[in-house]
């Protein structure tokens, strides 16, 4: 049903869903702080533009009585319950910043007539792709998939002279929300990744993964998994690994690789880490000081959500356009705005673009070094280290199938 919006006469409200079930176990207080910091910046920017308006946020809390698992498993109805609460209270703002869980976002989008924009820090799954009024400020699974296909096909770099067409995917069901949907996308038989690969098998048991490491009859040398070094070590332990195995460790929202004095443990030598390029000032900013390295991106997405709203509000007000229109609801895409830590670009479907970074462990220095970067906006790979000090033979990535010659 249509809900009246508190979004006119110089007063503009943002509805922030504070859900018990969240993509990351971040205290709601930290998210509130991020939103409030964003509001301060937006007010300053609007004032500088000569726009004398009020912008506030209303935090809508779930009662947590029914949906209390804390993770995303019971989030499907929580989002709808919160929307109902907003509807009953007639407290809808100009924009909804909220559900981070794919289940809740998908259900809310499906079950409501959204005439307002929805901004999500999360909603990683393919089921949230191509939604007309949804904006996602953390890299969704589709972006990861496009990188992997691009990298698999690459065969003209000094360190990668073979195209790959095979892969194992390790997915045991205990993943974090982001990893769950990333691996889900790789597993899906109808996905772009599956379509482009000739062979792909999902390993669901620890033993399956462990056996592949030294199995002479393995069908691929490449294993994709998602998590941090600790997660890999828990699984792999001190087991020997065949020399032509390549583990791709997807760990997008972890800035630790770029911190001072970090050294890679021995077990990371066969591993390429895929992560996001860290923000210029974020590692030392006051905003992120109290956040763990894996939570910075989540709180930052909330903050950037506020800044995105401020950006759109400014444009529409300067053009004398109405905020409570489908045009406004559909406008949060195909643009670049000034985020907390520099420009943020959204693609045609409202999904954030970013620079992904592939790291390797230098056998000389035991440091993580950048092998290449990938711009999700243009779907292009840029080599960085042309002569990496790899563990692999001849300092080149091996073929994905043992014993197969040049392609």
């Amino acid at each position: 049903s249509q809900v009246s919006q508190n979004c006119h006469n110089g007063s503009y409200e943002i509805s922030v869903l504070m859900m018990g079930n969240s993509a990351f176990a971040e205290p709601l207080k930290n998210l509130e702080d991020a939103v409030n910091e964003g509001l301060e910046i937006v007010r300053g920017r609007l004032q500088n533009a000569g726009l004398n308006v009020t912008v506030n946020a209303t935090f809508m809390y779930s009662d947590g009585l029914i949906h209390n698992s804390g993770d995303c498993r019971s989030s499907t109805c929580e989002g709808l319950d919160l929307l109902r609460k907003i509807s009953n209270a007639q407290r809808m703002g100009c924009v909804l910043i909220g559900p981070s869980c794919t289940y809740s976002t998908f259900q809310m989008y499906l079950d409501t007539e959204l005439s307002y924009p929805m901004i999500s820090a999360g909603s990683f799954g393919l089921s949230c792709d191509y939604k007309e009024t949804l904006t996602r400020l953390m890299s969704p699974a589709r972006k990861l998939m496009y990188f992997l296909v691009n990298f698999w096909k690459t065969n003209d770099l000094p360190f990668k002279t073979y195209s790959w067409s095979t892969s194992y995917v390790y997915k045991n069901g205990t993943e974090t929300e982001d990893c769950f949907w990333y691996l889900n996308a790789l597993e899906a038989s109808v996905s772009y990744f599956s379509h482009e690969l000739g062979f792909k098998v999902v390993l669901r048991q620890d033993k399956e993964f462990q056996d592949i490491l030294m199995d002479h009859n393995r069908k691929s040398n490449v294993i994709i998994m998602c998590g941090g070094p600790e997660f890999l070590y828990k699984l792999k332990g001190d087991r020997a690994v065949a020399e032509d195995i390549v583990i791709i460790l997807v760990d997008l929202f972890n800035d630790q690789y770029f911190e001072d004095n970090v050294t890679a443990p021995d077990y990371m030598k066969n591993v390429l880490v895929l992560t996001l390029s860290p923000g210029n000032s974020l590692l030392n900013s006051s905003f992120s000081r109290n956040l763990s390295p894996t939570k910075r991106d989540f709180a930052l997405a909330y903050l950037n959500g506020i800044l995105l709203f401020g950006h759109m509000l400014k444009i529409f007000l300067e053009n004398g356009e109405n905020i409570t229109t489908p045009k406004f609801a559909h406008a949060f895409r195909n643009l670049t705005f000034e985020g907390y830590d520099g420009p943020v670009t959204l693609d045609d479907w409202g999904d954030v673009d970013s620079t992904m970074v592939l790291l390797y462990t230098s056998v000389d220095t035991k440091k993580y070094k950048v092998l290449l970067t990938y711009d999700t906006h243009v779907n292009k790979t840029y080599p960085v280290d042309m002569s990496p000090t790899f563990t692999w033979k001849n300092s080149k990535l091996p073929n994905d199938i043992t014993g197969r010659g040049p392609q």
């Epitope: 070094p229 070590y233 001190d238 911190e259 004095n261 050294t263 443990p265």
Partner: nanobody, 115 residues
């Protein structure tokens, strides 16, 4: 941050034994590895023995059969039992840990083997 405190060093006669302790400020199974290194005067620091939370132990050739690395999971302490000591074992012994991200070092404990 991982803090390491070594103890148990001292003066011992050739053929004698000592047990060094390294108290770790974190649960030892939450970190990757704990090692013992030694540094003799005017020489480089060398790995003596290592333990990983995956359950592996390793030893330098010179100490195999004489030194044993072990852990107390309750006290989060790693021990180095040193038997059949020789004057060549005289050195400062350092505890080292890697928590999957960074290297940490203790202050060291002096071991002197002399008659």
């Amino acid at each position: 941050e991982v803090r390491l405190v070594e103890s148990g060093g001292g003066l011992v006669q050739p053929g004698g034994s000592l047990r060094l302790s390294c108290a770790v400020s974190k649960n030892i199974f939450s970190i990757y590895r704990v090692d013992w290194y030694h540094q003799a005067p005017g020489k480089q620091r060398e790995l003596v023995a290592g333990w990983t939370s995956g359950g592996s132990t390793s030893y330098a050739d010179a100490v195999k059969g004489r030194f044993t690395i072990s852990t107390d999971n309750v006290k989060d302490t790693v021990y180095l039992q040193m038997n059949s000591l020789t004057p060549e074992d005289t050195a400062v012994y350092y505890c080292h840990a890697h928590d999957h991200w960074r290297d940490y070092w203790g202050q060291g404990t002096q071991v002197t083997v002399s008659s």
